[in-house]
């Protein structure tokens, strides 16, 4: 079974290469009784939804930029 | 075609048992997480609880954790709850539902896409 | 726990007018957020998943939005087979929550 039928996880498996520029927002959800992993949920601006690896560095830029970016709007 | 059939509601006495079952057609049974939710008469939704594609995860509302227990036997396609000291305020239809949802191969979300058409149950004495 | 507010309880509407229900989280679910429609002695239909996304088969003329803690169903023009009560339901985590629902009566 997979994590996310196992658990209630939302993230199956995450996308390796997605540019900045094609992501509108990020939600990170922190694990919890619902999902033992931290999941990190990028809503793409053509709509669609796609989950990022939290241990990659350049997520860990995004996340970044994009909290940065909320704190000033 | 995609079915939930709930079975095994009734009349019981307060601290009395009761076991629920849902049989599951049209779909890969064992895939997909389930819930039971349940309405009391003339009152809201309630979800009761949801259990993991393999059954290996289980996850309880407060109001009924420690006195039921929900379960699914995939190789008969099938969902239970089993409702052990039972209360007047557990009176309701309940309803079990399938949790389905996966969008492209990277997200997956979950909603009761499929439901049951519900099987009453009463507590009183 | 999560709680899920509707507004409003209820709602007297004629054909063809446009109808907007709200749902508020009392903490942030992103869009981790469904509506279903519920008619008497029924079970519940879902209608929108993931804060605006029509599940197949419903009418158009039904849309969602919101992020994060407010939430909006809107139905652009009422049909006579819309008159039911609408519930909406975060996933965010455990428990699982619905709002109380929203009960939409012909005027």
């Known amino acids: 079974a997979s994590v996310a039928t196992e658990l209630r996880c939302q993230c199956l498996q995450t996308l390796q290469g997605i540019h900045p520029k094609n992501i509108q927002s990020v939600n990170v959800k922190s694990p919890g009784p619902h999902c033992a992993q931290t999941e990190v949920i990028a809503t793409l601006k053509n709509g669609r939804k796609a989950c990022l690896n939290p241990a990659s560095p350049i997520v860990k830029k995004i996340i970044e930029k994009m909290l940065n970016s909320d704190k000033s709007n | 075609e995609v079915q939930l059939l709930e079975s095994g509601g009734g009349l019981v006495q307060p601290g009395g048992s009761l076991r629920l079952s849902c049989a599951a057609s049209?779909?890969?049974?064992?895939?997909?997480?389930m819930s039971w939710v349940r309405q009391a008469p003339g009152k809201g939704l309630e979800w009761v609880s949801a259990?993991?594609?393999?059954?290996?995860?289980?996850y309880y509302a407060s109001s009924v954790k420690g006195r039921f227990t929900i379960s699914r036997d995939n190789s008969k396609n099938t969902l239970y709850l089993q409702m052990n000291s039972l209360r007047a305020e557990d009176t309701a239809v309940y309803y079990c539902?399938?949790?389905?949802?996966?969008?492209?191969?990277?997200?997956?979300?979950?909603?009761?896409?499929?439901w049951g058409q519900g099987t009453p149950v009463t507590v009183s004495s | 726990d999560i709680q899920m507010t509707q507004s409003p309880s209820s709602l007297s509407a004629s054909v063809g007018d446009r109808v907007t229900i709200t749902c508020r989280a009392s903490?942030?679910?992103?869009?981790?957020l469904h509506w279903y429609q519920q008619k008497p002695g029924k079970a519940p239909k879902l209608l929108i998943y993931?804060?605006?996304n029509l599940e197949s088969g419903v009418p158009s003329r039904f849309s969602g939005s919101g992020s994060g803690t407010d939430f909006t169903l809107t139905i652009s023009s009422l049909q006579p087979e819309d008159f039911a009560t609408y519930y909406c339901?975060?996933?965010?985590?455990?428990?699982?929550?619905f709002g109380q629902g929203t009960k939409l009566e012909i005027k």
């Open positions: 539902a399938r949790e389905g949802g996966r969008l492209e191969p990277y997200y997956y979300y979950y909603a009761m896409d499929v």
């Open positions: 049209g779909f890969t049974f064992s895939e997909l997480s």
């Open positions: 259990i993991s594609g393999s059954g290996g995860s289980t």
């Open positions: 903490q942030s679910i992103s869009d981790n």
């Open positions: 993931d804060a605006s």
């Open positions: 339901q975060q996933y965010y985590s455990t428990p699982l929550t």
